[in-house]
Amino acid sequence: QPPPPPPDATCHQVRSFFQRLQPGLKWVPETPVPGSDLQVCLPKGPTCCSRKMEEKYQLTARLNMEQLLQSASMELKFLIIQNAAVFQEAFEIVVRHAKNYTNAMFKNNYPSLTPQAFEFVGEFFTDVSLYILGSDINVDDMVNELFDSLFPVIYTQLMNPGLPDSALDINECLRGARRDLKVFGNFPKLIMTQVSKSLQVTRIFLQALNLGIEVINTTDHLKFSKDCGRMLTRMWYCSYCQGLMMVKPCGGYCNVVMQGCMAGVVEIDKYWREYILSLEELVNGMYRIYDMENVLLGLFSTIHDSIQYVQKNAGKLTTTIGKLCAHSQQRQYRSAYYPEDLFIDKKVLKVAHVEHEETLSSRRRELIQKLKSFISFYSALPGYICSHSPVAENDTLCWNGQELVERYSQKAARNGMKNQFNLHELKMKGPEPVVSQIIDKLKHINQLLRTMSMPKGRVLDKNLDEEGFESGDCGDDEDECIGGSGDGMIKVKNQLRFLAELAYDLDVDDAPGNSQQATPKDNEISTFHNLGNVHSPLK
């Protein structure tokens, strides 16, 4: 059936609409023309469009499409960007508090090791931060450096404080002896295991979030092909050429066009789903020694235990090292020589898991739940965009790319589009190079996430027992044990309420037990001073 003649024989409506897109009317015919030069809006009769108008429509259609895509991903993008920032800051806060707790432990229990110990601790936690952010640092080296640096100071200031100045330059020998004699027992090994596992998981978690942002940014800024531009023009603008200003594209037709335009993007879907599910698995396993909050905030206790271990064996060690490092032994070790020994308490310190408080762990689970609602994001994109752009209701007249029709069917559309543009061809072209790249990155992170996903059973770290780990306080599940005996000075009563904590940071003075004269009783302070009512900026 022939198309209805343009209701406006002067192309007046088309001119006024087009002027909004492109000031000036030189490209718009005053009256309908044959339009034999048109390549997209192929006319079946006189048309109010010119070749130049068609080009402008194509450009506008592609821009519209980009905007629609950006608004479609806005909520998801904000979710990941906000959480990546929140977690990065929260991890920094954990590291800062862990450093403060460790410094406080040295200050209160081993004043003769300060301020040297503060430097070693400072360097260690700086490295921890850098590692989390992706720096190429070896965790074992970090831990070794901490204990290598600590031992000479422990030996000369704590175990053998009477050494003359001339004997103080045995530093290098003491660093070597630290490893050769295993002076800290298996504590360095325990810390290496706990820190490397928890930091690896933390690092991959942040990497995964940052890749999520990259995925959204990539698809957000896709430049649509000319072929797609033609299809969109035909769907959105070709009706104007016939003076049909108010008609909307048919729903089914929109879906077909969008699937064609989005064919490459939709290929991400499979890997995106896997990404969210793998991230969920990782998050489910982030507890005990795989939870950096748990591990780092308990480090001060493990380090304290390691120094106690040295003190226990001081007599034997002093004799051996005296021979090894060839200095005359100035003073037999006496356990009460320094006040360092007075604050030793054998209570087991474990960082309590408080279920009803908003911790990092609950925040992670909340993020996963929200992400899971976006699991079909890419496969649903064509439909989402159609539902958020003008589309005719099923029972009304709609535009099928060529004419007004009662109802849209793919068959009719294909027939109508014969010799114009093949949707199938568009799909066969495969994804854009940038999409292929991002798919490769997703594959890589998914593989990493899968290899990092922790075993569900209690099979972790049994080798620590086999190697003769001496702290009996931990029972037989080392994976659950952070340190052995508490230092009696700092009691971490619950995990940090991080989201409230992000409202304001605490300095060293806020670390528990910050006075040299403190008694163990005075220092049984909860981690934070009543942070419960602080408004969280992140809710």
């Epitope: 410094n103 200050k107 004043p111 003769s112 300060t114 301020p115 040297q116 503060f118 430097e119 400072g122 360097e123 700086t126 490295d127 080296d141 450096e145 290598d148 640096s149 000479p152 100071v153 000369t156 200031q157 103080l168 330059d169 530093n171 290098e172 660093r175 300095d507 060293v508 003075d509 910050n514 006075s515 040299q516």
Partner: antibody, heavy 118, light 109 residues
Framework: QMQLVQSGAEVKKPGASVKVSCKAS????????MHWVRQAPGQGLEWMGW????????NYAQKFQGRVTMTRDTSISTAYMELSRLRSDDTAVYYC???????????WGQGTLVTVSS | QSVLTQPPSASETPGQKVTISCSGS????????VFWYQQLPGTAPKLLIY???LRPSGVPDRFSGSKSGTSASLAISGLRSEDEADYYC??????????FGGGTKLTVL
């Protein structure tokens, strides 16, 4: 004989950079943190930061963050302090100091006068 | 402006005793050790007292240090002309940095 020997005096223009060296001898260089302290003419001492010669780890005073870089070359037992975007108030004697096992700065270099003037 | 506060100058006659004060806060002297350095004219500083009141070998027992609360002091008895120098107190600060006093110029009259 334990000593720290620093490089000679420097005159620099504002905006330039200066790199001061500190060669250690008489002890194991990698076993002790090296600190840098400066002293403006007629003024007190000001701590700039430290480097762990063993690992290369550093910690800088807030005031110098972004302008100071401390490095070391263990093969020649030398620590370096580079200060960039020099201003006239950076005119000072720059000292390297070894932080001993007791926590104090037990050995100091002889100092390097850096004059910043246009 | 130095973090630790010292009197800019002090003077006393030979053989007498002089005390130099150093005032800080809870984040430095209050909870950390104090160190004292002597700087003779045109030379690098030299350690005098470590960990509040301990003397390295080679430092005469005329020099003594003490600490109370957020203040510390250096006492020099039996003053000699060679003691004429600048004296600096230093402490670790919990802001994770070392802090120094502005220095006290000691004149032996």
């Amino acid at each position: 004989q334990m000593q720290l020997v620093q490089s000679g005096a420097e005159v620099k223009k504002p905006g330039a950079s200066v790199k001061v060296s500190c060669k250690a001898s008489g002890y194991t260089f990698t076993g002790y943190y090296m600190h840098w302290v400066r002293q403006a003419p007629g003024q007190g001492l000001e701590w700039m930061g430290w480097i762990n010669p063993n690992s290369g780890g550093t910690n800088y005073a807030q005031k110098f963050q972004g302008r100071v870089t401390m490095t070391r070359d263990t093969s020649i037992s030398t620590a370096y302090m580079e200060l960039s975007r020099l201003r006239s108030d950076d005119t000072a004697v720059y000292y390297c100091a070894r932080r001993g096992l007791r926590g104090d700065f037990d050995y100091w270099g002889q100092g390097t006068l850096v004059t910043v003037s246009s | 402006q130095s973090v630790l506060t010292q009197p800019p100058s002090a003077s006393e006659t030979p053989g007498q005793k002089v005390t130099i004060s150093c005032s800080g806060s809870s984040s430095n002297i209050g909870t950390n050790h104090v160190f004292w350095y002597q700087q003779l004219p045109g030379t690098a500083p030299k350690l005098l007292i470590y960990r509040n009141n301990l003397r390295p070998s080679g430092v005469p027992d005329r020099f003594s240090g003490s600490k109370s609360g957020t203040s510390a002091s250096l006492a020099i008895s039996g003053l000699r002309s060679e003691d004429e120098a600048d004296y600096y107190c230093a402490a670790w600060d919990d802001s994770l940095s070392w802090v120094f006093g502005g220095g006290t110029k000691l004149t032996v009259l």
